[in-house]
Interface confidence: low
Amino acid sequence: MLFSSLLCVFVAFSYSGSSVAQKVTQAQSSVSMPVRKAVTLNCLYETSWWSYYIFWYKQLPSKEMIFLIRQGSDEQNAKSGRYSVNFKKAAKSVALTISALQLEDSAKYFCALGE
């Protein structure tokens, strides 16, 4: 049985021409993996803020957004259950790994940036 995760490009509050530009980019459009394996979803961001959080959300078919995990800019790599983050501040990269994949993990995943 295949796990099929559709990953959307999501740009979070990008203020063009402002000195407080925030930008979040997810380059993968979709990823398919077998159950019980792990998948890593990449997210790159830009920010002029010096203290911030990156959030990962899962969107259900009903469009409801479920919060998964939060990574602070001053914190060690976050981990919560089957979700873990590989945070590389210098590279402005915050990748989400979902381990032991289940069929219910099939969804859209969003990366967002905030204070």
Epitope: S18, S19, S48, D74, G114, E115
Partner: antibody, heavy 114, light 107 residues
Framework: QVQLQQSGAELVRPGASVTLSCKAS????????MHWVKQTPVHGLEWVGD????????AYNQKFKGKAILTADKSSSTAYMELRSLTSEDSAVYYC???????WGQGTSVTVSS | TPLSLPVSLGDQASISCRSS???????????LHWYLQKPGQSPKLLIY???NRFSGVPDRFSGSGSGTDFTLKISRVEAEDLGVYFC??????????FGGGTKLEIK
Amino acid sequence: QVQLQQSGAELVRPGASVTLSCKASGYKFIDYEMHWVKQTPVHGLEWVGDLDPGTGVTAYNQKFKGKAILTADKSSSTAYMELRSLTSEDSAVYYCTVWSADFWGQGTSVTVSS
Amino acid sequence: TPLSLPVSLGDQASISCRSSQSLVHSNGNTYLHWYLQKPGQSPKLLIYKVSNRFSGVPDRFSGSGSGTDFTLKISRVEAEDLGVYFCSQSTHVPPWTFGGGTKLEIK
């Protein structure tokens, strides 16, 4: 461009109240906490408190609890600080600031005098 | 009233900041920051978390220190550097607190 535009100078009587405003533009107002800072020659810079405009949640410096009330109007992207029961000790310049990006208003001077 | 530090243009200036308790957060970071306030202006961030220069801040500004003792160095003072320098901490919040300030002025 991010801007925090504060209201003009205030001259108020002892015992009265005053409300200062801080209009934000150039960023998503509800996403970032608005902080207020008091400055006097004697005490320097003092953090009054902060408000999360998205949720209305506030945090105050114990020293200013009951003195300052922080609110916000999301529709106009404006933060407010009401100062109550004013005395000469409240005479100061008050700044609003979106702290973790280092954006500050120009400051509002409050003078309490009879 | 801020302390006064008279300097000559082109000289190095060192401004110190001492905390009554360690500013090392439980997450390992030290939230000690430096601001410059020029006359008639609001404060502007120079250095955050001890040694990180904020965007647009010239490299003649550097921060160092650990625990309770911190220093801001200006390698070659220029006229535009004059003003009051404040340290501030956000390790133990609320409240976010500031030092009393050091006024950098021409000797």
